[in-house]
């Protein structure tokens, strides 16, 4: 084993190229200079190294940068990123959105790994807040990203970033998350006209208080049942039959199909039977 630590004559790597795929692991260790590897990281992805060979290359970078890789190297890691542990990534200082995109691209199509979660956390903390461009990027790769954040983390999202949010990005958000996001959405969209405003705010209404639902009921919005079913129960309960009828418009007929589910069930139980009868849906309080 001892003699294998020296690089065989004529095998010293002058550049990172395809010839290295024929090197044994110990030859890569002995014959590839770490500084050369760092300056030519962009070439590594074009070369079909085995996982074992990539382990050696990572080891060389770890030795060269024990405090964490510089961003110039991180941006070109490519598939070597998949070899990184969350502990490795916590040492990084990633500030460029291009670097983030490059690494997310490597993991594209897969579930969010602990490595990616750590990378995103480092990036967002470095920026100080979840700005619009970052949110755009993250939700493009992971539509459920926003709903993976705690209400506390969402508190740092500036209202301007809300423009980047698509309805599907909120599909898995719970009421506590919408609690925080809804006021931001109200600030972001308030200068839009009535119908456009409703289209934008609709996905966030799971965080709306009763008073806002009452206000919406006066605006002929025709809320669909799917949206109504996601409203906070405590916000729906004080609404009158007339207000719910105005809020839902032609969709009010859908209440019958949902009469056993919250918040419709609880709302029905709060209404006078005479009022429910005015809907003509056979709802029983």
């Amino acid at each position: 084993e001892v003699e294998k630590t020296a690089c065989p004559s004529g095998k010293k790597a002058r550049e990172i190229d395809e010839s290295l795929i024929f090197y044994k692991k110990w030859e890569l260790e002995a014959c590839v200079d770490a500084a050369l590897l760092a300056t030519q990281m962009d070439r590594v992805n074009a070369i079909p190294f085995t996982y074992e060979q990539l382990d050696v290359l990572k080891h060389k970078l770890d030795e060269l940068y024990p405090q964490g890789y510089p961003e110039s190297v991180i941006q070109h890691l490519g598939y070597l990123f998949l070899k990184m542990s969350p502990e490795d990534i916590r040492k990084w200082n990633v500030t460029s959105l291009e670097t983030l995109k490059a690494l997310l691209e490597v993991n594209k199509g897969h579930e969010m790994s602990p490595q990616v979660a750590t990378l995103i956390d480092r990036f967002v903390k470095g920026r100080g807040q979840l700005d619009k461009d970052t949110l755009d990027t993250l939700t493009a790769f992971y539509p459920g990203y926003l709903c993976s954040l705690s209400p506390e983390e969402l508190s740092s999202v500036p209202p301007s970033s809300i423009w980047a949010v698509r309805p599907q990005d909120l599909d898995t958000c719970d009421p506590r998350q919408l609690d925080v996001l809804y006021p931001k959405a109200r600030l972001a969209f308030q200068n839009m006209n009535g119908s456009e405003y409703f289209v934008k705010i609709q996905s966030f209404l799971g965080g709306a208080p009763t008073e806002d639902l009452k206000a919406l009921s006066q605006q002929n919005v025709s809320m669909d049942l799917a949206t109504f079913m996601k409203l906070r129960t405590d916000a729906v309960l004080p609404l009158t039959v007339a207000e719910v009828q105005k809020l839902l418009g032609p969709h009010v007929e859908g209440l019958k199909a949902e009469e056993r589910h919250r918040p419709v069930r609880d709302w029905i139980l709060r209404q006078r039977q005479d009022d429910l009868d005015t809907l003509g849906l056979g709802l029983q309080g």
Epitope: R176, V180, L187, Q190, P209, A215, D234
Partner: nanobody, 121 residues
Framework: QLQLQESGPGLVKPSETLSLTCTVS?????????WGWIRQPPGKGLEWIGS???????YYNPSLKSRVTMSVDTSKNQFSLKLSSVTAADTAVYYC??????????????WGQGTLVTVSS
């Protein structure tokens, strides 16, 4: 148009509890989506401390959670912050903040002018 005004002692001893009150004028505190506190240590960026939402849910910065208590008194149009076991690292300008407009067509986020709290013996 809401006006927010922070009040409380400007000097607190280490290990004691910092208590601040935010008095709201120009409108009812009940029409707010949330009531919150933010601070800015000297030479550093803003740090969110916590918020109480209209729904009744309260959220605190995880790094401060064990030491923070926030409450709202709608009858006095005030909300308050208590931060226990303070150290010199808690020296900062403290701002109260609120977003009104519940049930209205427009909404606005308001901040107090800030109050400097120094932790020193």
């Amino acid at each position: 148009q809401l006006q927010l005004q922070e009040s409380g002692p400007g000097l607190v001893k280490p290990s004691e509890t910092l208590s601040l009150t935010c008095t709201v004028s120009g409108g009812s505190i009940s029409n707010s989506y949330y009531w919150g506190w933010i601070r800015q240590p000297p030479g550093k960026g803003l740090e969110w401390i916590g918020s109480i939402y209209h729904s009744g849910n309260t959220y605190y910065n995880p790094s401060l959670k064990s030491r923070v208590t926030m409450s709202v008194d709608t009858s006095k149009n005030q909300f308050s912050l208590k931060l226990s076991s303070v150290t010199a690292a808690d020296t900062a300008v403290y701002y109260c903040t609120s977003q009104d407009g519940v049930g209205a067509t427009t909404t606005e986020e308001y901040w107090g002018q800030g109050t400097l709290v120094t932790v020193s013996s």
